[in-house]
């Protein structure tokens, strides 16, 4: 008897379900009465489900497996498991008997991502060029182990004094620790990549020391270290400063904005004169500023597609730079509800409710609840769509049973300005009615 | 435009040296490190090391340690490389290139056109 | 050092055959990056990062792998893609370049 199964590893998130394919070939005239299945841990022959004397002998694996019985005449032996572990990944051995006999294995590869890097600094405060400081890189909770990867800010591998170690925790996903020692220059920015090898995920961080004195010559440029949020078509600061010294002519300086992904030029200052935007016609320096240090770059009605990381360059005898985030985000409109079927209504009908909100950005957050704040998740569908400014319009469908009356409420939230935006409807009455309450 | 411009062909002798050079223009010059990769008739790539042009840091392959100097003029946004001890293998095309991206990906994104040096007696 | 293994060394095809050069790491690497090279020209940025086209490479061609295994691939090849292609890594020092594959169109 010839049984099938995948060639590949079978994948499986921790906490997901899987499937484990295994497949027979039933001769015409089988019955599920003449079926023996056994599936089974490979290595340990730990009995896992079976399926005998026409009936399904249900799971001996922490009562986490299931056949598919509709499709085991078919010919489809396939078992799930329910919220896979760490300690489930191995082979698992589908036996077949009918008259003859057959099985196979198919392998079964657990993945949990890892967290984002976070970062820490030691010693972290009045560091200064020379000093030797211990930077730890920590990603939590992946599997299986991570290959972890440091580099400068322009891309060269730091691979000396580098110590990484992994913890498994009880449920075996690991932790990992990354520590680099480097001895630092005028600044620096040093960036950890950890990788995930079989789900093939990079998590990455980066941080940038600048020592509090710099060699001389060196220019000190200071943006904020909050992204800036801006409104779409309003207008944006991005504050760039540096600390001009005794005597500084603006015919010294060399000023460049410029995206920090692509390189490309925004807006420029040389030879002493504001060389203009080259972004669209919508930036401008502060030039009555310039002088006392302020290179701050004015955007113009502000769009989708200028989020993102802006890097203003200064040039005097020696050179600086840092780059600032820009936040796009718009509010999204007061929910419409609209209610199908919306005539008629009696308790124990089925309606389709949908909340419609438009033009916002980032995405949003929707919610919906009832008329007493229990919150409504089942049979909820949301859709966003963006529309050629790059703006979301969102629409989310509930649908419900009515009972004798009820209000639903949906809520939409801008997860960057942390607004929100709500509409109910209440259906009551007997005949019902609908009536729209907005608050 | 970003351009990397390298310096015309050399014939050198054996025991001499040679200085490449490499004008950048269209960006700025000390945000990226500029590398030297080189290419013998009819053989592969072959990395010689880097300079990052801000902080003037260089790092060389083991096999050019010692006889290869990589140097960076901000003023005039150029890069040299200087090959000493000079023989008939150094025959090559020697190419700068700009190493782009960002954290924590990167790429030669811009080459020079290549200059050929052949050291023959 | 990190070795750059490429297979094949070289291929002959004909146009529209679907090309794939293997690059193999002595070591894992966070990465991979494409050079293609024309005869007498400077070589060419095609895929960085593993799988992403570089700006202007036409959509046949895609990259692949992770770990010590990278893949690039061409779909539907083209009379123009007659160059040798190299695979380049810097996870670890010295920066190193696979020996190269030439590809020759029938």
């Known amino acids: 008897l010839e049984v099938q199964v995948p060639e590949d590893p079978v994948v499986a998130l921790v906490g997901t379900d899987a499937t484990l394919c295994c497949s027979f070939s039933p001769e015409p005239g089988f019955s599920l009465a003449q079926l023996n299945l056994i599936w089974q841990l490979t290595d340990t022959k730990q009995l896992v489900h079976s399926f005998a004397e026409g009936q399904d002998q249900g799971s001996a694996y922490a009562n986490r497996t299931a056949l598919f019985p509709d499709l085991l005449a078919q010919g489809n032996a396939s078992l799930r498991l329910q919220r896979v572990r760490v300690a489930d990944e191995g082979s698992f051995t589908c036996f077949v008997s009918i008259r003859d006999f057959g099985s196979a294995a198919v392998s079964l590869q657990v993945a949990a991502p890892y967290s984002k890097p976070s970062m820490t600094l030691e010693p972290n405060k009045d560091l200064r060029p020379g000093d030797t400081v211990t930077i730890t890189c920590s990603s939590y909770q992946g599997y299986p182990e991570a290959e972890v990867f440091w580099q400068d800010g322009q891309g060269v591998p730091l691979t000396g004094n580098v110590t990484t170690s992994q913890m498994a925790n009880e449920q075996g996903l690991f932790d990992v620790h990354s520590i680099l020692r480097v001895v630092l220059g005028a600044n620096g920015t040093y960036s950890c990549l950890v990788r995930n090898p079989v789900l093939q995920q990079d998590a990455h961080s980066s941080v940038t020391i600048t020592p509090q004195r710099s060699p001389t010559g060196a220019v000190e440029v200071q943006v904020p270290e909050d992204p800036v949020v801006a409104l779409v078509g309003t207008d944006a600061t991005l504050r760039c400063s540096f600390s001009p010294e005794p005597g500084f002519s603006l015919a010294q300086l060399n000023l460049i904005w410029q995206l920090t992904d692509t390189k490309q030029l925004v807006h420029s200052f040389t030879e002493g004169r504001d060389q203009g935007s080259a972004y669209a016609n919508r930036t401008a320096l502060f030039p009555d500023l310039l002088a006392q240090g302020n290179a701050s770059l004015r955007l113009q009605r502000v769009r989708v597609a200028d989020e993102g990381s802006f890097t203003c360059f200064v040039s005097i005898r020696d050179f600086g730079s840092a780059a600032v985030s820009l936040q796009v985000a718009a509010p999204y409109s007061k929910p419409s509800m609209t209610l199908e079927p919306n005539k008629d209504l009696r308790p124990g009908d089925t309606v389709t409710i949908t909340c419609s909100s438009y033009r916002g950005y980032p995405e949003a957050e929707v919610f919906w609840q009832d008329g007493q704040g229990v919150p409504l998740t089942g049979n909820v569908t949301t859709s966003q769509m963006a529309n050629e400014q790059g703006l979301f319009d969102v629409h989310s469908v509930l649908r419900v049973v009515l009972g004798a009356n009820g209000t639903y409420s949906c809520l939409v939230r801008n997860p960057v300005l942390q607004q929100d935006a709500h509409g109910s409807v209440t259906i009551t009455g007997q005949p019902m009615t609908h009536h729209h309450h907005h608050h | 435009e970003v351009q990397l411009v390298q310096s015309g062909a050399e014939v050198k002798k054996p025991g001499s040296s040679v200085k490449v050079s490499c004008k950048a223009s269209?960006?700025?010059?000390?945000?990226?490190?500029i590398h030297w990769v080189r290419q013998a008739p009819g053989q592969g790539l072959e990395w010689m090391g880097y300079i990052n042009p801000n902080s003037r840091n260089t790092d060389y392959a083991q096999k050019f340690q010692g006889r290869v100097t990589l140097t960076a003029d901000k003023s005039t946004s150029t890069a040299y490389m200087e090959l000493s001890s000079l023989r008939s293998e150094d025959t090559a095309v020697y190419y700068c290139?700009?190493?782009?991206?960002?954290?924590?990906?990167?790429?030669?994104?811009?080459w020079g056109q290549g200059t050929t040096v052949t050291v023959s007696s | 050092e990190i070795v750059l293994t490429q297979s094949p060394d070289f291929q002959s095809v004909t146009p529209k055959e679907k090309v794939t050069i293997t690059c193999r790491a002595s070591?894992?690497?966070?990465?991979m990056n494409w050079y293609q090279q024309k005869p007498d020209q400077s070589p060419k940025l095609l895929i960085k990062?593993?799988?992403n086209l570089a700006s202007g490479v036409p959509s046949r061609f895609s990259g692949s792998g992770s770990g010590t295994d990278f893949t690039l691939t061409i779909n539907s090849l083209e009379a123009e893609d007659a160059a040798t292609y190299y695979c380049?890594?810097?996870?670890?020092?010295?920066?190193?370049f696979g020996q190269g594959t030439k590809l020759e169109i029938k």
């Open positions: 380049q890594q810097w996870s670890s020092n010295p920066l190193t």
């Open positions: 290139a700009r190493y782009s991206g960002s954290t924590p990906y990167w790429y030669f994104d811009v």
């Open positions: 070591s894992s690497v966070s990465y």
């Open positions: 990062a593993t799988s």
């Open positions: 269209g960006y700025s010059f000390t945000s990226y490190t």
